[in-house]
């Protein structure tokens, strides 16, 4: 028997992926475990193998179909179970009735690019990836810019309260190297959380013109 506290957290990316993390204190070391997804009103079910991410936690991705296919709706409830092998049988270690559109975490934004750069400002655009058409324009973004000599944690957060896939960064220093990241979150969902941060985009502002203050 396994003692200790167990935590089983899953998020839906709004299209065809449910990512899960299972943590177990006093966990089993050499046991094979998996997550099993059983929707209440679909003809399919899906399984993924839990792989260790730390000493007491495991993760896996339930791939429900093609990346941009709408595999679940807001009416679906999915029974998610953690099953671990005990000899010849499987034991249920954790279970939850999962409402996909109450537990959203979208994929990180992609295709970041500099649209236009000047001495003091830079216009950057990005795209959202594998996000359901359900959201229409009801998404919000957070962005941050890494300045020289600072850490990401120190970077102030810029909030975009609408589906705006670009930003104009102002009051930058000329001829300076910066990095930029953005993340996205739908308004829908009681337990919805921010996507991971995008891959950083590096850019450099233009040097100030000699003898001029631009």
């Amino acid at each position: 028997a396994v003692n200790g506290t167990s935590q089983f957290t899953c998020f839906y990316n709004s299209r065809a992926n449910i990512s899960c993390v299972w943590s177990q204190d006093g966990a089993l070391q050499d046991t094979s475990c998996q997550v099993h997804a059983w929707p209440d009103r679909r003809r399919w079910n899906q399984t993924c193998e839990l792989l260790p991410v730390s000493q007491a936690s495991w993760a896996c991705n339930l791939i429900l179909g093609a990346p941009d296919s709408q595999k679940l709706t807001t009416v679906d409830i999915v029974t998610l179970r953690v099953l671990c092998r005990e000899g010849v049988r499987w034991r249920v270690m954790a279970i939850q009735d999962f409402k996909p559109f109450e537990n959203l975490r979208l994929m990180a934004p992609i295709s970041l690019q500099v649209v236009h750069v000047e001495t003091h400002r830079c216009n950057i655009s990005w795209e959202i990836s594998q996000a359901s058409h359900y959201f229409e324009r009801h998404l919000e973004f957070e962005a941050r810019t890494l300045s020289p000599g600072h850490t990401w944690e120190e970077a102030p957060l810029l909030t975009l309260k609408q589906k705006q896939e670009w930003i104009c960064l102002e009051t930058l220093t000329p001829d300076t190297q910066y990095e930029f990241q953005v993340r996205v979150k739908p308004l829908q969902g009681e337990f919805t959380t921010w996507s991971p941060w995008s891959q950083p985009l590096a850019f450099r502002t233009k040097p100030a013109a000699l003898g001029k203050d631009t």
Partner: antibody, heavy 117, light 107 residues
């Protein structure tokens, strides 16, 4: 500009079937959910169901699922709602609307259906 | 099916004054509550989503709030065009359901 234009008023006999159309413009119909809502006098607003034009999936409210069929023609950007076995209490204004699954962002002008012998 | 109860059924307020409309859910619906305005002979119009998020193009005098299963729509200073019927709608449990409406009339 987003527009949803519904077909005209209908008078039907009890037991008959009515089919209402909703022609849309100003947005990508193939990436939209199209909903139908009934507003009967004294009964208020009732959600009938929706169709996801992207994949053709439908969702019907339990109170209507035996009698309603929602379809979408992506070649003409038109949604349809068919209600069968009509009875007098189906006398109402029927609205098509566009939105995510959770709320209705844009509405048609409404179609009045009168069921009378 | 979740029952949405709006109160009062009719509210009489003078132009320029504040109007407070209430909507209560029969069970917990998180923030899955949306507000619409309907004028005579017209389709409803979406005002507020998720209890408190204003829709773009809706005047700032419209605001929403939540306390448990009770939701409030506040119109801070009533204009003549605000007199209409207001509906709340839940999207927590299918089928989504509407309240019976509050008629806001000129005092």
């Amino acid at each position: 500009e987003v527009q949803l234009v519904q077909s005209g008023a209908e008078v039907k006999k009890p037991g008959a079937t009515v089919k209402i159309s909703c022609k849309v413009s100003g947005f990508n119909f193939k990436e939209s959910l199209m909903h139908w809502v009934q507003q009967a006098p004294g009964k208020g607003l009732e959600w009938m169901g929706w169709i996801d034009s992207e994949n053709g999936e439908t969702e019907y409210a339990p109170g209507f699922q035996d009698r309603v069929t929602i379809t979408a023609d992506t070649s003409t950007d038109t949604a349809y709602m068919e209600l069968s076995s009509l009875r007098s209490e189906d006398t109402a204004v029927y609205y098509c609307a566009r939105g995510g699954p959770w709320f209705l962002s844009y509405w048609g002008q409404g179609t009045t259906v009168t069921v009378s012998s | 099916e979740i029952v949405m109860t709006q109160s009062p059924a009719t509210l009489s307020v003078s132009p320029g004054e504040r109007a407070t409309l209430s909507c209560r859910a029969s069970q917990i619906i998180s923030n899955n509550l949306h507000w619409y305005q309907q004028k005579p002979g017209q389709a409803p119009r979406l005002l507020i989503i998720y209890g408190l998020q204003s829709i773009s193009g809706i005047p700032a005098r419209f605001s929403g709030s939540r306390s448990g299963t009770e939701f409030t729509l506040t119109i801070s200073s009533l204009q003549s065009e605000d007199f209409a019927v207001y509906y709340c709608q839940q999207s927590n449990n299918w089928p989504w359901t509407f309240g019976q409406g509050t008629k806001l009339e000129i005092k």
